[in-house]
């Protein structure tokens, strides 16, 4: 028989999405046991029928990768989990409506920081996503978000920071003191979607000035 409250077997059914990798996660409820099994279905918003996710039927782990199934950027999706206990009790819970564009969070960018004598160069590498274009190429975040820009900061001392930003991939902070350590932070920002990545940090030291030796 079904439990009085589905939360006894199943809680917190939600998508966790980062750089468009969309993972469905959930927790077992207080009545859940290690041998409780979970089956996952998903559907596109507006469709009537649920589709069973292959590889996520009668599983005991509490996550299921739905990246491929929810890969259309213009669609909205739902997923649901059905938990069945060893005693035959079952409960089903559905996610909120999911939009990868809206809900995905951004990981820190991949950056190369290069020391020079009086400057520090930062080269941002485009971030790939699991989403494939029609030609088979993987889309980068730059392909998806028109307004994506990079915000770079260089901590010069306790009270002074230098800032650069833009849609370019190469930046250079000039006018620095040779043989000095600096802390750089680089973030991805997408203002129209109110997204900001955690920062990539690099601690770099300008090269010594050999011209005087």
């Amino acid at each position: 028989h079904a439990p009085e409250d589905p939360s006894d077997l199943l809680q917190h059914v939600k998508f966790q999405s980062s750089n468009f990798e969309n993972i469905l996660t959930w927790d077992s409820g207080p009545e859940g046991t290690p041998d409780t099994v979970y089956s996952i279905e998903y559907k596109t918003y507006g469709e009537r029928d649920w589709v069973a996710k292959k590889g996520c039927q009668r599983i005991t782990r509490k996550s299921c990768n739905l990246t491929v199934e929810t890969g259309n950027l213009t669609e909205l999706y739902y997923a649901r989990v059905t938990a069945v206990s060893a005693g035959g009790r079952s409960a089903t819970k559905m996610t909120d409506r999911f939009s990868s564009l809206q809900h995905t969070t951004l990981k820190p960018p991949d950056v190369t920081c290069i020391s020079k004598v009086r400057s520090i160069q930062m080269i941002v590498h485009p971030t790939p996503t699991p989403i494939r274009a029609g030609d088979g190429h993987r889309l980068t975040l730059e392909d998806i978000f028109h307004d994506l820009f990079y915000h770079l900061e260089l901590q010069v001392n306790r009270t002074y920071q230098m800032h650069l930003g833009g849609k370019q991939r190469e930046y250079e902070f000039f006018g620095l003191t040779p043989d000095t350590e600096f802390l750089g932070t680089i973030m991805i920002c997408v203002p129209t979607w109110a997204k900001e990545s955690a920062p990539y940090m690099c601690r770099v030291k300008t090269l010594p000035d050999r011209t005087w030796t």
Epitope: L73, H137, I144, F149, K167
Partner: antibody, heavy 117, light 107 residues
Amino acid sequence: EVQLVESGGGLVQPGGSLRLSCAASGFTFSSSWMYWVRQAPGKGLEFVSVINTRSGITHYVESVKGRFTISTDNAKNTLFLQMNSLKSEDTAVYYCATRIQGLIDYWGQGTQVTVSS
Amino acid sequence: DIQMTQSPSSLSASLGDRVTVTCQASQSIRSSLNWYQQKPGQAPKLLIYGASRLRIGVPSRFSGSASGTSFTLTISGVEAEDLATYYCLQEYAWPLTFGQGTKVELK
């Protein structure tokens, strides 16, 4: 050398349609953001639409939504702007432009669109 | 949409004059501002990007600066070839929006 060459402009009656083309060369067209920008006679510049040639993601300015459609033919390195239900206020020179290495730095020479009865 | 208020709409300058054009954004756009030069019958040409970074090949008499949501283009000594219309462009968020333009004429 980057080159953008627009064509397809002309005189059209209000309510009519026109399809602009922009032939691109000298850069990787299949992974770029491409724009249509217009300039009404004696007026300023206005971004009309943008498309990412790889993802197909598009954006439009509010005044043309539902009337204009931006698209590409990546095999032919060509950008299009299908303009329907044209109004007199759409009269302008239409430029295509591209963003290369983060900069909107390359523009075509423009094609004139006149909407008049 | 982000509004860009550009001033003055026109100005007269003598050759060698220092000229400044300003743009005010209706909200924060960080440093996502470009300056373009346009001559009659031509497409716009990028001069400054990122509020203050000079495009390669652009003469050093052009410079850009920013303070909060206010941006300035300065021509330190106007030459005859600089007589044109100048536009600021915010690239922070779609729709990208230009200022109304500043026509620089000879006095």
